[in-house]
Amino acid sequence: SGTTNTVAAYNLTWKSTNFKTILEWEPKPVNQVYTVQISTKSGDWKSKCFYTTDTECDLTDEIVKDVKQTYLARVFSYPAGNVESTGSAGEPLYENSPEFTPYLETNLGQPTIQSFEQVGTKVNVTVEDERTLVRRNNTFLSLRDVFGKDLIYTLYYWKSSSSGKKTAKTNTNEFLIDVDKGENYCFSVQAVIPSRTVNRKSTDSPVECMGQEKGEFRE
C-alpha cells in the first residue's frame, strides 16, 4: 500500500543504554524522508525528528519523563519533495516499533571502578555512580537513584598470581572484601538487575589492579 515512490520503514529497533534511547530503522532513504512519533500506551502521539533523512531518532528526552511507562513509536515515510503526500488510504505510510519499557529494558552501561583502598587485610572498592539523563527536580539522577536496590554490583577479584575469580555482591556502590596481606589483587565489576529476565547484566568494567594509580594502601 502507499505511494509508489515511498517505502515503509522496517526493522524498527530500540537501542538504549542507561536510558539514552535511540530508535533505529531501515532502509536508508532514497527520495524519501521520515518523521517519528512516540507515545505511551494511554498518551498522545508526539512528533520528533521531523522530515529527516537519518535512520535513527534520539527519543531520550521523551522516555526519561517516566522510565517505567511503556512506549510505542512509529516511523512515517514521505516523498522527499512532497511531504504532504499521503498513501493510498489517505495517510502517510508508517510502521510501528516494538513496545519499549525503559526501566525493564535499557541496557546497563559498562561500570567503572572509581577507587579502591586497602587497609590491612581489607579492601574497599567503590563503583562510580554513573549519571543518567533521567531528571528529577531539575537534577540528573544517577543509576542508583533510578534503580535503587533493584541494581546490584558483582565484584570479581583475584590474586594477580592466580586465575580463579572470587565474587562479592552489593546493593550499594561499595564493597568491603578480605584479602591476603602482601598479595596484589585485580578487580572488575558488573552491574546486574536480578529481577529482570533480559538485559540483566552490563559488560564488565575495565580491570583495575593494586599497585596501579586508582588504589591507595594504608597499613
Epitope: Y156, K165, K169, T203
Partner: antibody, heavy 120, light 107 residues
Framework: EVQLVESGGGLVQPGGSLRLSCAAS????????IHWVRQAPGKGLEWVGY????????YHADSVKGRFTISADTSKNTAYLQMNSLRAEDTAVYYC?????????????WGQGTLVTVSS | DIQMTQSPSSLSASVGDRVTITCRAS??????VAWYQQKPGKAPKLLIY???FLYSGVPSRFSGSRSGTDFTLTISSLQPEDFATYYC?????????FGQGTKVEIK
C-alpha cells in the same frame, strides 16, 4: 519454563576423564552464573565451582583445582564440567544450578543430576 | 573458607510438630544465607533466601531468621511431605559453602 539438564555421567576408571554437560532452557545462561555442586553417596552437598558465561570467569573448589575445568558455550546455552585425573572420592551425583546473581545469590534452579562413578 | 555448622544432624518429629534447624557461620555472612530441601534421589529445592525470604511457591509454614551469625529454619507445623534433608548455604563470599545437612525423619 526454566530447566537445567545434566548429561555425560557414567562409570570411569581412576585417572580417567569425563565431560559433563548442563543444557539450559527457558533462560539465557549469559545472564546468570552457573554452579556445579556434587553429592557423594549418602553425603552432603559440596560446591565444585562456578562460571559466569558472560565473561568466562570461573572459580574452582580447592578439592578439584587443577583437575576440573568449568566452561560454557553461550551459543549452545550450555555449561560444561571437564573432569580429568578422576579419583574414587570424585564419585558423586553432579548437579548444575543457576545463581540468580542477587545479593544473596541463592541457587534458584537445579538440574536433576548425573551420576559419576570412579572405580576400577 | 567460611564454615556453616548445622545442627542437629538428624531429628525425629511427628506431623504437626514445630521443627527448628540452626546453622552457625564461622564469620559474618550478612544475610546471604539460603535454605534448601532435598528428598532422596532428587535435586535440592530452594526454600528460603536472604536468610528470611520465602521463595516463590514455598508454603508459608517454612520461615527463616537471622541473629548475628546464627541462622534458623523453622517449620511451624510439619507435614508428611516435609520429611527430607535440609541444608543451609552461605553465598556471602567465594567459595559458597553448605551446612552438613539435617535429616528430618518420622518419629
Amino acid at each position: 519454563e526454566v530447566q537445567l539438564v545434566e548429561s555425560g555421567g557414567g562409570l570411569v576408571q581412576p585417572g580417567g576423564s569425563l565431560r559433563l554437560s548442563c543444557a539450559a532452557s527457558g533462560f539465557t545462561i549469559s545472564g546468570y552464573i552457573i554452579h556445579w555442586v556434587r553429592q557423594a553417596p549418602g553425603k552432603g552437598l559440596e560446591w565444585v565451582g562456578y562460571i559466569d558465561p558472560s565473561n568466562g570467569y570461573t572459580y574452582h573448589a580447592d578439592s578439584v583445582k587443577g583437575r576440573f575445568t568449568i566452561s560454557a558455550d553461550t551459543s549452545k546455552n550450555t555449561a560444561y564440567l571437564q573432569m580429568n585425573s578422576l579419583r574414587a572420592e570424585d564419585t558423586a551425583v553432579y548437579y548444575c544450578a543457576r545463581d540468580d546473581q542477587s545479593v544473596s545469590s541463592p541457587f534458584d534452579y537445579w538440574g536433576q543430576g548425573t551420576l559419576v562413578t570412579v572405580s576400577s | 573458607d567460611i564454615q556453616m555448622t548445622q545442627s542437629p544432624s538428624s531429628l525425629s518429629a511427628s506431623v504437626g510438630d514445630r521443627v527448628t534447624i540452626t546453622c552457625r557461620a564461622s564469620q559474618d555472612v550478612n544475610t546471604a544465607v539460603a535454605w534448601y530441601q532435598q528428598k532422596p534421589g532428587k535435586a535440592p529445592k530452594l526454600l528460603i533466601y536472604s536468610a528470611s525470604f520465602l521463595y516463590s511457591g514455598v508454603p508459608s509454614r517454612f520461615s527463616g531468621s537471622r541473629s548475628g551469625t546464627d541462622f534458623t529454619l523453622t517449620i511451624s507445623s510439619l507435614q508428611p511431605e516435609d520429611f527430607a534433608t535440609y541444608y543451609c548455604q552461605q553465598h556471602y563470599t567465594t567459595p559458597p559453602t553448605f551446612g552438613q545437612g539435617t535429616k528430618v525423619e518420622i518419629k
